[in-house]
Structure formats: C-alpha cells, structure tokens
C-alpha cells in the first residue's frame, strides 16, 4: 500500500523543525520514547502529539522564547506553527481520542523531534518499499 500523505507531511514538517535552533528548542519535554516497549504505534503517535500540545500550549507566549529581536520572535512563531501542524497530523495518524503520558524521563524538544523523525522515516521506508 502507498504511504499516507499525512506521513509525508509529518516528515516534511519535522525536517523544517529540526533545521534550526531557537531559544526554546532546548527546553525539556516528557521523553515518551524512553519506555515505549509494549506500546502500539498508534499510542506512540498519540502520546507524541500530547507532548507537543503540552509544549506549545505552555510556551507559545513564553517571553524568553519570543525573544527580544524580530528574528527570534519570527523563529519562535514559526516553531509554534510547525508544532501545531505536527500535532494535528499526529492525531490524524493515531486515530485515538486521548492517551496518558507519564511525566518520567525528560528530553530536550530538539532531541524529541529528532527521535520522532527517525521513527517516521522508518515507517515511511517500510510503507514505500
């Protein structure tokens, strides 16, 4: 079967997100990948979406993230826009209404996104072969 268009969109968004650092990409998020054994793919996507939603809800108007220059402000706004798009697409892929996220291990947002990108690329290579 062909790869879902949503999956391609997710990878494209993740590529954009991991290209540049902002003042807040080193803030931490719950590392859902640290204990992801016995977790279905759909649960992983759902939890990833939940973590991203928590992040942008909490930091969208964070003064240190918005920065003090026009460039910093623009990059942060772009980051939030991409995270919202990613969140929306992950929910679509997960097909679940909600999922619990235990706040245990921590990861920086940039490491979290890199890990998610690896998972999505692996999924894409499987469905395109």
């Amino acid at each position: 079967h062909k790869c879902d268009i949503t999956l391609q969109e997710i990878i494209k968004t993740l590529n954009s997100l991991t290209e540049q650092k902002t003042l807040c990409t080193e803030l931490t998020v719950t590392d859902i990948f640290a204990a992801s054994k016995n977790t279905t793919e759909k649960e992983t996507f759902c939890r990833a979406a939940t973590v991203l939603r928590q992040f942008y809800s909490h930091h969208e108007k964070d003064t240190r993230c918005l920065g003090a220059t026009a460039q910093q402000f623009h990059r942060h706004k772009q980051l939030i826009r991409f995270l919202k798009r990613l969140d929306r697409n992950l929910w679509g892929l997960a097909g679940l209404n909600s999922c619990p996220v235990k706040e245990a291990n921590q990861s920086t947002l940039e490491n979290f996104l890199e890990r998610l990108k690896t998972i999505m690329r692996e999924k894409y290579s499987k469905c395109s072969s």
Epitope: K21, T25, E26, T28
Partner: nanobody
Amino acid sequence: EVQLLESGGGLVQPGGSLRLSCAASGFTFRNFGMGWARQAPGKGLEWVSWIISSGTETYYADSVKGRFTISRDNSKNTLYLQMNSLRAEDTAVYYCAKSLGRFDYFGQGTLVTVSS
C-alpha cells in the same frame, strides 16, 4: 538530582556592578538552555535572560538590555550573569533556572540589593 546553586549577590550602590554565578549539577549542563529570572519585593517572577547550550543565542528582558550579560562555561558547569549600571529597580532575588518538563527548575536564589 538537579541542583542549582547561585552566588555573587549582595549590596551595591546605584551604577555599580555585580557578577552572579550558578553552579549546576545533576544533569548534562552542556545540553540545556539555562537562564536567570528575578523576583522583586511584592512582584511576580520576571525572566531576565536566557542562553542556549552553545551560547550563540541569548535573550534579554528590555529592562536589562545593554546592561546585563549572560554567559556560560560548559567545562565548569557554570552559568553567569554580569550586571553593570545597576539601578534601584534591579533589587530582587535572582534565580538560576533550567527547563524541567512543562515547568522550570529554580535554585534557591541570591539577593541583589541596589541602594545608596
């Protein structure tokens, strides 16, 4: 366990300088953005400055821009805040901070009093 220990606060005259230090332990310091926040008497917490791990990107509140400089020494696991041209309104408890999930982790703080 994350530990942040601030030092360098004290009493200083208007126009004077102070250098705050924050010794960090319990996590890989070089991987994380770090910052300084302050709380003046009877007021809320205000972000003063933030710096990413490489030190290449920084944020300063408008009230301190041009007077304060944030820096870090990743080999010493230490964060600094150089404060020049201090004003009475800079009087506050200054906290070293790191991100911790949806929250921020703060040290115990160091008091800076600017008075003649």
